[in-house]
């Protein structure tokens, strides 16, 4: 959106679907006139949940959002809701900028860096352009993770950014792996964090007019090894009609690399269990967590034979976890009948150790999953 004198969406027509969500950068002192809907039938404008009055410096009137002279406190989220239906017609975020160029998704100019094609604007102290990206002040992350701190800012002249750790200049020279500074992104990135990275990180943004700073707190959590955690309730009991497709989901959380197997409990010679008391199972799918789709078991065109108990089994270097669910398959001709499948069993009773693979787990624990 280019604007030489004011930010304006014209004519005052209902926005296209592509217009519904926009982010506009507005220069301080710049008038704003945004339209939503048709004149008398225009929508109501709200800022941060409060409806704008039809009079005043910032007003919502006949479908228009009008700001006489844009101030820093005018930045924020603006919604235009259709009269009566409360349908969102416009979803705008106004951001304080330092040039008379309003940015949209196609162009995100930072032309204030090149004053040759600019008018002369008054100097301005630094200010945060995207404070919503700075809301997370405390970063508590596991050791080995990547951490990113951001302090997007602007000002005139364009400010510089530098970083402090615990009040001291921080360039990362003493940090294994160093740091990554992207000045155009106003960001500091540290990969593979370790406990010695804990501390207070300060971004200091300054220009000739003034300076601003913001503190982030980093806590590095030392990993406590544990066997995989399976999200409760997954896989879930499922009822399907013959011929339909079924997806069983298993969400696995594990610091150590987990291996996952999907098992179907089967009956051999009329029995579900072997003489040793362990169940007969068929391995349907096996892979590690990084494999595509491993946490989802797809059953295509199910038949009555697919009904039964399914188990998601996950193991890592620490141990093993597994949970089961039942699939009930209904005949095609009677889709209204519903069977009460047994409760999903959280079969997580045993502690296991792990040697080198799931089969070794079973061997080591004498768990003979008969196939």
């Amino acid at each position: 959106l280019e604007a030489s004198e004011e930010v304006e969406l014209e004519p005052c027509l209902a926005p296209s679907l592509e217009q519904q969500e926009q982010e506009l950068t507005v220069a301080l002192g710049q008038p704003v006139r945004l339209c939503c809907g048709r004149a008398e039938r225009g929508g109501h404008w709200y800022k941060e949940g409060s409806r704008l009055a039809p009079a005043g410096r910032v007003r919502g009137w006949r479908g228009r959002l009008e700001i006489a002279s844009f101030l820093p406190e005018d930045a924020g989220r603006y919604l235009c809701l259709a009269r009566g239906s409360m349908i969102v017609l416009q979803n705008l975020t106004l951001i304080t900028g330092d040039s008379l160029t309003s940015s949209n998704d196609d162009e995100d100019p930072k032309s204030h860096r090149d004053p040759s094609n600019r008018h002369s604007y008054p100097q301005q102290a630094p200010y945060w352009t995207h404070p919503q990206r700075m809301e997370k002040k405390l970063h508590a992350v596991p050791a080995g993770n990547t951490v990113k701190f951001r302090c997007p800012a602007a000002g005139n002249p364009t400010p510089t950014i530098r970083w402090l750790k615990d009040g001291q200049a921080f360039h990362g020279e003493n940090r294994i792996g160093g740091i990554r500074l992207r000045h155009q992104h106003w960001s500091l990135v540290m990969e593979s964090v370790v406990p010695s990275d804990r501390g207070t990180y300060t971004c200091l943004v300054e220009n000739a007019v003034g300076s601003i700073r913001y503190n982030y707190l980093l806590d590095v959590l030392e990993r406590s090894p544990h066997r995989p955690i399976l999200q409760a309730g997954l896989p879930a009991n499922t009822t399907a009609v013959v011929g339909s497709d079924v997806e069983l989901l298993c969400k696995v959380y594990s610091d150590a690399q987990p291996h996952i197997q999907w098992l179907k409990h089967i009956v051999i010679n009329g029995s579900s269990f072997g003489a040793d008391g362990f169940p007969y199972v068929q391995v349907l799918k096996t892979a590690d967590i990084n494999s595509s789709e491993v946490e989802v078991l797809y059953l295509r065109n199910v038949s009555a034979e697919d009904a039964g108990e399914y188990t998601c089994l996950a193991g890592n270097s620490i141990g093993l976890s597994y949970q089961s669910a039942w699939l009930t398959v209904l005949p095609e001709e009677d889709p209204t009948w519903t069977a009460a499948a047994p409760e999903a069993r959280y079969t997580d009773k045993l502690e296991f150790r792990h040697d080198s693979g799931l089969n070794d787990i079973f061997e080591a624990q004498k768990i003979e999953w008969h196939e």
Epitope: D105, K110, D114, Q184, H185, V189
Partner: antibody
Framework: EVQLLESGGGLVQPGGSLRLSCAAS????????MSWVRQAPGKGLEWVSV????????HYADSVRGRFTISRDNSKNTLYLQMNSLRAEDTAVYYC????????????WGQGTLVTVSS | DIQMTQSPSSLSASVGDRVTITCRAS??????LNWYQQKPGKAPKLLIY???NLQSGVPSRFSGSGSGTDFTLTISSLQPEDFATYYC?????????FGQGTKVEIK
Amino acid sequence: EVQLLESGGGLVQPGGSLRLSCAASGFTFSDYAMSWVRQAPGKGLEWVSVIEGDASYTHYADSVRGRFTISRDNSKNTLYLQMNSLRAEDTAVYYCARERTYSSAFDYWGQGTLVTVSS
Amino acid sequence: DIQMTQSPSSLSASVGDRVTITCRASQDISSDLNWYQQKPGKAPKLLIYDASNLQSGVPSRFSGSGSGTDFTLTISSLQPEDFATYYCQQHYSPSHTFGQGTKVEIK
């Protein structure tokens, strides 16, 4: 209109070198970070390298670090990728892409240039 | 590096269907996730940036959600031109890794 046009691809032997170029137009080139992204035949997208608008920052994927060098000439509105010690696994279509400010999303892409590494 | 895992790797759907593709990061990446669409022989096209923001010119039937490690791309009503491969990409770490892709095919 934003346009990105890659060139310089072709057939090269393992161990050889190639220099790709990406000519940009329709926007203030120096205001934007630029990246190279590649796609091996029948495979997915792999990010290769990025360079900040003022060339103050570069970064590389582990698979190419030490062999590839990204650079730019803002006076010519051109992005480059110097590829040395090429391997068969570097065979791919190479795209240059513009980074959307702040979000590091690639909002404009070139049409790609094919690099084939084979003896 | 941060790994991105997409699921499913392929799916079959019909015009008008609601389609959901998921992407999981190996660690918290805040909302630093983008979605792209790619058709055979063409360059990718940006659909969603920063997890939930619709790129200019992209139809509103596309939407993105999620933060942290789990993200979703939803096509509310699949259109003929939407049959393509979709990729997620994280930009939290310096190496902007992509997911392996999800191919959406006609049923």
